[in-house]
Interface confidence: medium
């Protein structure tokens, strides 16, 4: 599949800069506004908190000989899970959660939540058309993933209002391609 455009649907996130002696004092403030994910905590440096990044993808479907007449629009779920303020009971990690530790056995991943099935027409080089039935992603969500699970099996635990893991490394999650089948 060819991605012609990808639009990020979340507001820009800037991480605080570690305080070093030579750094600029204004730029170097670790900001707490909007970091605590409470409904009234967005007073300073306000930004929208998102559960995970929903990237809007516009792409053409091709099976080798035939290509879709019009581009397909769908969401691609990507990035780290930053909790939504509206997640029930989520108020950040407590000391007792031990989620800070690198050795935490759980991670939160941004995965497909809602999908819909639609038919799409492909125009072939010989002038004929083919109809495919494809599944496109319409929403993303954070799911808790235990590390002993095989990543490829997508054996995720169900969503709960527990406290998310604090991530110590960037995780790249490859988005699933749209599933398609001949019909």
């Amino acid at each position: 599949f060819k991605n012609d455009a990808t639009e990020i649907l979340y507001s820009h996130v800037v991480k605080p800069v570690p305080a070093h002696p030579s750094s600029n004092s204004t730029l170097n403030q670790a900001r707490n506004g909007g970091r605590h994910f409470s409904n009234t905590g967005l007073d300073r440096n306000t930004r929208v908190q998102v559960g995970c990044r929903e990237l809007r993808s516009t792409k053409y479907i091709s099976d080798g000989q035939c290509t879709s007449i019009s581009p397909l629009k769908e969401l691609v779920c990507a990035g780290e899970c930053l909790p939504l303020p509206v997640l029930p009971n989520w108020i950040g990690g407590g000391y007792g959660t031990k989620y800070w530790s690198r050795r935490s056995s759980q991670e939160w991943r941004c995965v497909n939540d809602k999908t819909r099935t639609q038919r799409i027409q492909l125009q072939c080089q010989d002038g004929s058309t083919r109809t495919y039935k494809i599944t496109v992603v319409t929403a993303c969500k954070c799911k808790r993933y235990t590390r002993q699970h095989n990543e490829s099996s997508h054996n995720f635990e169900s969503m709960s209002p527990a406290k998310p893991v604090q991530h110590h490394r960037e995780r790249k999650r490859a988005s699933k391609s749209s599933k398609h089948s001949m019909s």
Epitope: N32, S38, G92, G93, Y95, G96, W100
Partner: antibody
Framework: EVQLQQSGPELVKPGASVKISCKAS????????MNWVKQSPEKSLEWIGE????????TYNQKFKAKATLTVDKSSSTAYMQLKSLTSEDSAVYYC????????????????WGQGTSVTVSS | DIVMTQSHKFMSTSVGDRVSITCKAS??????VAWYQQKPGQSPKLLIY???YRYTGVPARFTGSGSGTDFTFTISSVQAEDLAVYYC?????????FGGGTKLEIK
């Protein structure tokens, strides 16, 4: 403005109990863990425990598990700590402190503290 | 429990001087360390968290560094109002623990 207003000083007899309050204002009370810290000249600062005001879930320092009980009243945005079977070793200043959780900076720390409640245990 | 050791109970300095306070953890705590300032008769105040992140509104003269077991809190140019006790605290494991404090005295 975020404020944590603690109850006044307490003078109690050995063996008695005391309940300290910490009224939060200026922020969403259920949006942050509340921690409790003991400060005494002998032991400096000691973490007693924390409570999730949304669920009432608590985590205690093992040392204080039999000594302290943490509760909250969401309707009044107030956190409480009850100390029981008091002895002279419990004489100290007790603080409530809101837990700062920075997801991007991967850090915890206590960003707002109450003014402290002095507890004196004496016969 | 992890023990946080601040080797100097007292440190004497002059206005304008650079001063560094050290803190040693009994085991690796990564960068899970915060620094607090407590002025006489006041509650502790958060200055640095995650070893090097300056908290909101904290002047740029206050910095933190270190990882693993050794941590340093530095005031690049001491002001008269910096007279206080400074505490380090680890939050790598429960219970979080504090150092014994270093009292900064101004000559």
């Amino acid at each position: 403005e975020v404020q944590l207003q603690q109850s006044g000083p307490e003078l109690v007899k050995p063996g008695a109990s005391v309940k300290i309050s910490c009224k939060a204002s200026g922020y969403s009370f259920t949006g942050y863990y509340m921690n409790w810290v003991k400060q005494s000249p002998e032991k400096s600062l000691e973490w007693i425990g924390e409570i999730n005001p949304t669920t009432g879930g608590t985590t205690y320092n093992q040392k204080f598990k039999a000594k302290a009980t943490l509760t909250v009243d969401k309707s009044s945005s107030t956190a409480y700590m009850q100390l029981k079977s008091l002895t002279s070793e419990d004489s100290a200043v007790y603080y409530c402190a809101r837990l700062h959780y920075d997801y991007d900076g991967v850090g915890y720390a206590m960003d707002y503290w109450g003014q402290g409640t002095s507890v004196t245990v004496s016969s | 429990d992890i023990v946080m050791t601040q080797s100097h109970k007292f440190m004497s300095t002059s206005v304008g001087d650079r001063v560094s306070i050290t803190c040693k953890a009994s085991q690796d705590v990564s960068t899970a360390v915060a620094w607090y300032q407590q002025k006489p008769g006041q509650s502790p105040k958060l200055l640095i968290y995650s070893a090097s992140y300056r908290y909101t509104g904290v002047p740029a003269r206050f910095t933190g560094s270190g990882s693993g077991t050794d941590f340093t809190f530095t005031i690049s140019s001491v002001q008269a109002e910096d007279l206080a006790v400074y505490y380090c605290q680890q939050h790598y494991s429960t219970p979080p623990t504090f150092g014994g404090g270093t009292k900064l005295e101004i000559k």
